[in-house]
């Protein structure tokens, strides 16, 4: 239904707290350099305006679209050109071009310092003084660093944060209560961010149809007892929600997500037997819970997939009558039978099936042609299964840090032109797949590994797009989203690369490394490892291990020395010489 005032409608639906949070996220994602105070001022102005519209929907400007209202606010910011350069040109455009322009200027890798967590005592003091401002800072800092973070989900993480602080700040040992809990939230939020970015990439590059196919596969795996019409309805609604969030329409997105959660809870009987626990929770927790609810039990009497999609004489007729519906049904039927496959794999199989029908249905004897299609799926299924086995075996042998290093070597060889910080970030993230997925039961490993890797590689592609340097990466990133991971896996050493000169300063370290937290120490060592590979792309694993062991020993010795500075300045050059010799 049409509302006289869109802003009043959303304010009423969402309530003041969520309304303000979402407007803050929207502004922080669009203008990533502005301070919290600048954004908080705009949010208050927008909220005050929304309240006047709630009181009188016919008041001046209340009939304007949200894009117009928000865009006008952003464009009124002083010194916009000085701080944001060409983004200010967006303000010369009319809606909807202005909003599109803002979206195009979102920066996936803003030059902002890492979000440092204050020490426990200070955190608790500022939280107790003003919980609202404290949580506002959290929303602002996360949103500006992750301009595509799924807004209603960020509100959920803020709520988690709030609950942890409320609980831990009342404890005697605040630090040991806060640290593991907040680390857990941070880890989950970072994974949520890369997953959502992947969804937005899918939507931006390949349109709603591609996202809807993803949704059909995912929902069919989770709700195998729901019929195709129900899955299609859920996929259509979920596509709308994600389209809105990816497009910066955060109020509509959060409102529609709440509606979808409500619908699911009112229709549990036709969707899944596993929803009740989620449906008993308050809104943000309910929607989050539904998004990661466990798979329902598969119906026991499902016929073989071949019956309708291979053996039936009507295959080509059904395909001709409604291509998308027929392929959608195939994806639904295959996915509900395979919760043990990744969504990426299911989409590759559907694509293979579509290509087979395109070819075979044009032949004089189609059934003889498409009769072997399921057998042709086998290599497509075996490839990711082998990937999971090989990588989980390696992870179990090396542990997370060692596994990250193995991946770092592999990816630096595949794309040595990529900047070292990007390679290290990618390898560290890709390496976390071991901890995240390899400990799961066998039937959950493949979907966990491949869909997580795909999301991380999407980030690699986004960063590479800004400054393309590797033909290998460009090739893998320009194909379809579901083919990226197999493409990267298949890359070998880049033979076109001219090795980097050996620079002693790259491998020169100082005593300040000793006081760094373990994570930062690892990053320093991994940076050196990537640089070594860039210097000697064909170095053997054994050579690299020798050098890295020597390096670790050097750090250990010098960090324990009484005079650390002297140790680093005398032993450092020796280390560099030994490294050169070992790699000669």
């Amino acid at each position: 239904e049409a509302h006289k005032s869109e802003i009043a409608h959303r304010y009423n639906d969402l309530g003041e707290q969520h309304f303000k949070g979402l407007v803050l996220i929207a502004f922080s994602q669009y203008l990533q350099k502005c301070s919290y105070d600048e954004h908080a001022k705009l949010v208050q102005e927008v909220t005050d305006f929304a309240k006047t519209c709630v009181a009188d929907e016919s008041a001046a400007n209340c009939d304007k679209s949200l894009h117009t209202l928000f865009g006008d606010k952003l464009c009124a910011i002083p010194n916009l050109r000085e701080n944001y350069g060409e983004l200010a040109d967006c303000c010369t455009k009319q809606e909807p071009e202005r909003n599109e322009c803002f979206l195009q200027h979102k920066d996936d890798n803003p030059s902002l310092p890492p979000f440092e967590r204050p020490e426990a005592e200070a955190m608790c003091t500022s939280f107790k003084e003003n919980p609202t401002t404290f949580m506002g800072h959290y929303l602002h800092e996360v949103a500006r660093r992750h301009p595509y973070f799924y807004a209603p989900e960020l509100l959920y993480y803020a709520e988690q944060y709030n609950e942890i602080l409320t609980q831990c700040c009342a404890e005697a040992d605040k630090e040991s209560c806060l640290t593991p809990k907040l680390d857990g939230v941070k880890e989950k939020a970072l994974v949520s961010s890369v997953r959502q970015r992947m969804k937005c990439s899918s939507m931006q590059k390949f349109g709603e149809r591609a996202f809807k196919a993803w949704a059909v596969a995912r929902l069919s795996q989770t709700f195998p007892n729901a019929d195709f019409a129900e899955i299609t309805k859920l996929a259509t609604d979920l596509t709308k929600v994600n389209k809105e969030c990816c497009h910066g329409d955060l109020l509509e997105c959060a409102d529609d997500r709440a509606e979808l959660a409500k619908y699911m809870c009112e229709n549990q009987a036709t969707i899944s037997s596993k929803l009740q626990t989620c449906c008993d929770k308050p809104l943000l927790k309910k929607a989050h819970c539904l998004s990661e609810v466990e798979h329902d039990t598969m119906p026991a009497d499902l016929p073989a997939i071949a019956a309708d999609f291979v053996e039936d004489q009507e295959v080509c007729k059904n395909y001709a009558e409604a291509k998308d519906v027929f392929l959608g049904t195939f994806l639904y039927e295959y996915s509900r039978r395979h919760p043990d496959y990744s969504v990426s794999l299911l989409l590759r199989l559907a694509k293979k099936y579509e290509a087979t029908l395109e070819k075979c249905c044009a032949e004089a004897n189609p059934p003889a042609c498409y009769g072997t299609v399921l057998a042709e799926f086998q290599p497509l299924v075996e490839e990711p299964k082998n990937l999971v086995k090989t990588n989980c075996d390696l992870y179990e042998k090396l542990g997370e840090y060692g596994f990250q290093n193995a991946i770092l070597v592999r990816y630096t060889q595949k794309a040595p032109q990529v900047s070292t910080p990007t390679l290290v970030e990618a390898a560290r993230n890709l390496g976390r797949v071991g901890t995240k997925c390899c400990t799961l039961p066998e039937d959950q490993r493949l979907p966990c590994v491949e869909d997580y890797l795909s999301a991380i590689l999407n980030r690699v592609c986004l960063l590479h797009e800004k400054t393309p340097v590797s033909e290998h990466v460009t090739k893998c990133c320009s194909g379809s989203l579901v083919e990226r991971r197999p493409c990267f896996s298949a890359l070998t050493v880049d033979e076109t690369y001219v090795p980097k000169e050996f620079k002693a300063e790259t491998f020169t370290f100082h005593s300040d490394i000793c006081t760094l937290p373990e994570k930062e120490k690892q990053i320093k060592k991994q940076t050196a490892l990537a640089e070594l590979v860039k210097h000697k792309p064909k170095a053997t694993a054994e050579q690299l291990k020798t050098v890295m062991d020597d390096f670790a020993q050097f750090l250990d010795t010098c960090c324990k020395a009484a005079d650390k500075d002297t140790c680093f300045s005398t032993e450092g050059p020796n280390l560099v010489t030994r490294c050169k010799d070992a790699l000669a």
Partner: nanobody, 115 residues
């Protein structure tokens, strides 16, 4: 949706000829192989002939080989069946179908071969 409309049937003497047409709409005609199937009074459905989307490949049932010719005009979205040397046992309702389908969803056209 998909529509198939057969025409050209009628009464013909043994040894005579007929040309059946099938006008197709609602799908990308040139992307699909097409077939003719027939059903004689009181009998089951019998496959007659098939042609690929480009028209380069054709297949015939042994019972009609050498007498019938299947063809298509993709610019007109039309399928044809040229039937020569007709026999009484060719009497049937003829249907055009998509791909290897042995089910019909159209009216068909009646061919009667009788003296």
């Amino acid at each position: 949706g998909v529509q198939l409309l057969e025409s050209g049937g009628g009464l013909v003497q043994p040894g005579g000829s007929l040309r059946l047409s099938c006008a197709a709409s609602g799908f990308t005609f040139s992307s699909f192989g097409m077939s003719w199937v027939r059903q004689a009074p009181g009998k089951g459905l019998e496959w007659v002939s098939s042609i690929s989307g480009t028209g380069s490949d054709t297949l015939y049932a042994d019972s009609v080989k050498g007498r019938f010719t299947i063809s298509r005009d993709n610019s007109k979205n039309t399928l044809y069946l040229q039937m020569n040397s007709l026999r009484p046992e060719d009497t049937a309702v003829y249907y055009c179908t998509i791909g290897g389908s042995l089910r019909y969803s159209s009216q068909g056209t009646l061919v009667t071969v009788s003296s």
